[in-house]
Interface confidence: medium
């Protein structure tokens, strides 16, 4: 199996992780994309994802996670604001392309968040109590993808996953009201 490389980010509590996942523009511009965490001894879990189809430059906020897909540049921008120590871990970007397996984007992100004075901005961030005013998304199904009668998301390669949402629409009343899809199914 190919050893996936990792890119390490060391940030303080309160700062913002700001990463860009590159993808092949022609193949994946409108594909749905997701941000996943890989916890030791567990399956990857999807924390947030773009809409289906993915909209150009349209920010989606899920709790403290903000995704923006820039079709023109072939990159997914991921921000995690107001970082907490417990956010430390291994993350990856994934592109959903049913009925084929999802496509993982390299490199994985090893995030290390430490306690400390966060008044000093991180290497790529103005400090921390930034409040991102992003309107909540109103899509019917967020992470899951097609299947009838329920929507489904397949798992990333070599992980155990697939997911679906209930038949009813997900009503988003605020920016935290978006499901996280654990990608073991």
């Amino acid at each position: 199996a190919t050893k996936l490389t990792e890119e390490k980010y060391e940030l303080k509590e309160g700062q913002t992780l700001d990463v860009k996942c590159d993808y092949t523009l022609e193949k994946f511009a409108s594909s749905q994309k997701a941000w996943q965490i890989i916890r030791d001894g567990e399956m990857p879990k999807t924390l947030a994802c773009t809409e289906r189809p993915s909209k150009n430059s349209h920010p989606v906020q899920v709790g403290r996670i903000i995704l923006e897909d820039y079709h023109d540049h072939g990159l997914l921008r991921v921000r995690m604001v107001n970082l907490q120590v417990e956010d430390s871990g291994l993350y990856q970007c994934v592109i959903y392309q049913p009925p084929k397996e999802p496509h993982m984007l390299f490199d994985r992100i090893r995030l290390v968040v430490t306690k400390g004075f966060s008044g000093t901005p991180g290497s790529n961030e103005n400090s921390t109590q930034n409040v991102y005013k992003i309107p909540p998304t109103t899509t019917k199904a967020l992470c899951p993808l097609y299947t009838s009668p329920r929507t489904v998301t397949q798992a990333p390669p070599k992980s155990t996953a697939d997911v679906s949402t209930p038949d009813s629409e997900i009503n988003l009343t605020n920016v935290t009201d978006i499901i996280r899809v654990p990608v073991f199914n």
Partner: antibody, heavy 118, light 113 residues
Framework: QVQLVESGGGVVQPGRSLRLSCAAS????????MHWVRQAPGKGLEWVAV????????YYADSVKGRFTISRDNSKNTLYLQMNSLRAEDTAVYYC???????????WGQGTMVTVSS | DIVMTQSPDSLAVSLGERATINCKSS????????????LAWYQQKPGQPPKLLIY???TRESGVPDRFSGSGSGTDFTLTISSLQAEDVAVYYC?????????FGGGTKVEIK
């Protein structure tokens, strides 16, 4: 209609083997992770095992690790649980269940009874 | 493993009255980055398989009557039946799905007084 139907239960002696099946219909079986959950008579629910949508990953409860094997045949829309070295404490109703948008279980079969007794 | 503790073990409530079931997890099932609680509630009637009622601690599964509601966060959760109906007689289980293995509470039997 989304449906899961278990079969293969019965009475078996300790130390013997049994294979349970779960036939899925009404949804794209090959896209879903699947679980086995059991319930001893008069007791609560106990998670047994889970398999990924493509069968590449499997996880087991400590109580069955090394004795039970979960598998699936996506071409037949069927989930299996091979149970070896059965013990009296494995006596239970065995349910297959579909994993949904979280790890919660949104569709359950009716269950099949396994009795391990000499 | 996360231990799920339900209380009470059984509950007798008059028709039309409120029934409240508590569930406590041995560690938080709240995922801070997306603010979701990884807790579900199931109903199991005699001779039937469990049925999903609530997920993400407070989201009702489609088709579940609105007299059922879930609340709580972190480690303490509650399932409330606002006005008990005869068909609600069942055992109710909470389940965490944040950390493997998935674990269930011991169940609460709801009966009519």
């Amino acid at each position: 209609q989304v449906q899961l139907v278990e079969s293969g239960g019965g009475v078996v002696q300790p130390g013997r083997s049994l294979r349970l099946s779960c036939a899925a219909s009404g949804f794209t079986f090959s896209s879903y992770g699947m679980h086995w959950v059991r319930q001893a008579p008069g007791k609560g629910l106990e998670w047994v095992a889970v398999i990924s949508y493509d069968g590449s990953n499997k996880y087991y409860a400590d109580s069955v690790k090394g004795r039970f094997t979960i598998s699936r045949d996506n071409s037949k829309n069927t989930l299996y649980l091979q149970m070896n070295s059965l013990r009296a404490e494995d006596t239970a109703v065995y349910y297959c269940a579909r994993r949904s948008s979280g790890d919660y279980l949104d569709v359950w079969g009716q269950g099949t009874m396994v009795t391990v007794s000499s | 493993d996360i231990v799920m503790t339900q209380s009470p073990d059984s509950l007798a409530v008059s028709l039309g009255e409120r029934a409240t079931i508590n569930c406590k997890s041995s560690q938080s099932v709240l995922y801070s980055s997306n603010n979701k609680n990884y807790l579900a509630w199931y109903q199991q009637k005699p001779g039937q398989p469990p049925k999903l009622l609530i997920y993400w601690a407070s989201t009702r599964e489609s088709g579940v009557p609105d007299r059922f509601s879930g609340s709580g966060s972190g480690t303490d959760f509650t399932l409330t039946i606002s006005s008990l109906q005869a068909e609600d007689v069942a055992v109710y289980y909470c389940q965490q799905y944040d950390v493997d293995p998935l674990t269930f509470g011991g169940g609460t039997k709801v009966e009519i007084k």
